[in-house]
């Protein structure tokens, strides 16, 4: 903390300019008027202040706005944003996407900080839903943003926003998150033709049910193995050998390399060995000929 000392004669700041970088820390505190600072915030980022000097300027603004900064000040914070705590940010009401972008720019190249997470949370809650423009902005700065949300939070994403999602934005999503996102993506892309639809829906397929995978197998999509390995095991198990062959197309040969890994391993155990042999890949572990397969889950459902 900077001690309260009187401003030396002739040092009172008449405007926010470069002369302030030569001030002692206590002189900045004593000689810069908070109201002047607030009206000339746009100048702060044009002056080569150190982080420590920004600390003092923040302290001045805190005294002027104990209930939280107005958006007119927030939009000009620039690198002063890095000195804010999550507690400070919770007092703000940020409504402009331009303000959000300006503050995210400051943290660019760094991991998402608690300050940024709080800012995004405040902004999204203020809007009521994660609209396309906001999602576009957030995923541009933080590709993993979408996967940091809980399934409950993802449920507020409107299908129209899904158009802003890039494949890399889903890299760290788990099956529970994809379960929520897949139906939205299916709805968003429903009017596209077969091949274009598959290109768009592909990264969301980790949330697809069996019936949708069966439908895709009839469309010559040639799903790659990386996508297939991310499918829900429970959605893959009911697929027949013929359906998987159609789904993967020329990529079906890749099954051999993945035969020990889920969901391929579990799927093989459910197929007749005769059927697997038709692929000519040497896949082993299927149900031997002459064995009767009882689907106990089906039996339970009927009783």
């Amino acid at each position: 903390e900077v001690e309260k000392t009187a401003c030396p004669s002739g040092k009172k700041a008449r405007e926010i300019d470069e002369s302030l970088i030569f001030y002692k820390k206590w002189e900045l505190e004593a000689c810069v008027d908070a109201a002047l600072l607030a009206t000339q915030m746009d100048r702060v980022n044009a002056i080569p202040f150190t982080y420590e000097q920004l600390d003092v300027l923040k302290h001045k603004l805190d005294e002027l706005y104990p209930q939280g900064y107005p958006e007119s000040v927030i939009q000009h914070l620039g690198y002063l944003f890095l000195k804010m705590s999550p507690e400070d940010i919770r007092k703000w009401n940020v409504t402009s996407l331009e303000t959000l972008k300006a503050l995210l720019e400051v943290n660019k190249g760094h991991e998402m900080s608690p300050q940024v997470a709080t800012l995004i949370d405040r902004f999204v809650k203020g809007r009521g839903q994660l609209d396309k423009d906001t999602l576009d902005t957030l995923t541009a700065f933080y590709p993993g943003y979408l996967c940091s949300l809980s399934p409950e939070e993802l449920s507020s994403v409107p299908p129209s926003s899904i158009w802003a999602v890039r494949p890399q934005d889903l890299d760290t999503c788990d099956p529970r998150q994809l379960d929520v996102l897949y139906p939205k993506a299916r709805l968003a892309f429903q009017n596209m033709n077969g091949s274009e639809y598959f290109v768009k829906i592909q990264s969301f397929l980790g949330g697809a049910p069996t019936e949708d995978l069966k439908a895709l197998s009839q469309q010559n999509v040639s799903m790659d193995l990386a996508t297939f390995m991310k499918l829900r095991t429970d959605a893959v198990l009911p697929l027949t050998v013929a359906e998987v062959q159609k789904l993967l197309g020329p990529h079906v040969e890749g099954l051999k390399a993945e035969e020990r890994h889920r969901p391929v391993r579990d799927w093989i155990l459910r197929q007749r060995q005769d059927d697997l042999d038709t692929l000519g890949l040497g896949l082993q572990g299927g149900i031997p000929n002459g064995y009767l397969v009882l689907d106990l889950s089906m039996q339970e459902a009927l009783s």
Epitope: E3, Y23, K24, K25, W26, N45, P48, E52, L82
Partner: antibody, heavy 118, light 112 residues
Framework: QVQLQESGPGLVKPSETLSLTCTVS????????WNWIRQPPGKGLEWIGR???????YYNPSLKSRVTISGDTSKNQFSLKLSSVTAADTAVYYC????????????WGQGTMVTVSS | QSVLTQPPSVSGAPGQRVTISCTGS?????????VHWYQQLPGTAPKLLIY???NRPSGVPDRFSGSKSGTSASLAITGLQAEDEADYYC???????????FGGGTKLTVLS
């Protein structure tokens, strides 16, 4: 993890201009500011200057008349030029970045030795 | 001549406590600006040891501590170990120069 790498000629003739580049990898050059610091053999550290995200620069007054620091965001690099060099400018030159929100340098390049000699 | 003054050398036996002082003036440490400390092992770049007078970055052992008072600051190392043998530098901002200034460095020798 952000890494810095200095590059440039290891030998410069007296009265010529020393030119070094710092390449930033694993992160964006859009941090608040970046620095050049040097260390003559067997001596202490001397801050040369800093360049801000918006191109603003500030230099050590003792070197100000000879120093230019510039940035190239498209290449994720920033550069140092020191003109009219003498043997006294022989040093290891480091580029460094401050810790986020703190004026302490937590990321340094490994340094590059520059000798001024004819 | 460095703006911040440090003793050229200090030494101590393993397990002992040593302190390194850093003396400034009214335009840097005495102006209220923070002090940061670096450790430099031979042939390597400096490594941040203490920032903001007394804060340790993650990974720095709690044997290292810093403090500041008036126009000076100090670095204390307890439970001295052979790997602590290095050069130590203090740094602060100088308002009259509008730039960072360093101490001349202190060579720490761990006696065997």
């Amino acid at each position: 993890q952000v890494q810095l790498q200095e590059s440039g000629p290891g030998l410069v003739k007296p009265s010529e201009t020393l030119s070094l580049t710092c390449t930033v990898s694993g992160g964006s050059i859009s941090s608040y500011y970046w620095n050049w610091i040097r260390q003559p053999p067997g001596k202490g550290l001397e801050w040369i200057g800093r360049i801000y995200y918006n191109g603003n620069t500030y230099y050590n007054p003792s070197l100000k008349s000879r120093v230019t620091i510039s940035g190239d965001t498209s290449k994720n690099q920033f550069s140092l030029k020191l003109s009219s060099v003498t043997a006294a400018d022989t040093a290891v030159y480091y580029c460094a970045r401050p810790k986020l929100g703190i004026d302490a340098f937590d990321i340094w390049g490994q340094g590059t030795m520059v000798t001024v000699s004819s | 001549q460095s703006v911040l003054t440090q003793p050229p050398s200090v030494s101590g036996a393993p397990g002992q406590r040593v302190t390194i002082s850093c003396t400034g003036s009214s335009s840097n440490i005495g102006a209220g600006y923070d002090v940061h400390w670096y450790q430099q092992l031979p042939g390597t770049a400096p490594k941040l040891l203490i920032y903001g007078n007394s804060n340790r970055p993650s990974g720095v052992p709690d044997r290292f501590s810093g403090s500041k008072s008036g126009t000076s600051a100090s670095l204390a190392i307890t439970g001295l170990q052979a790997e602590d043998e290095a050069d130590y530098y203090c740094q602060s901002y100088d308002s009259s120069l509008s730039g960072w200034v360093f101490g001349g460095g202190t060579k720490l020798t761990v006696l065997s």
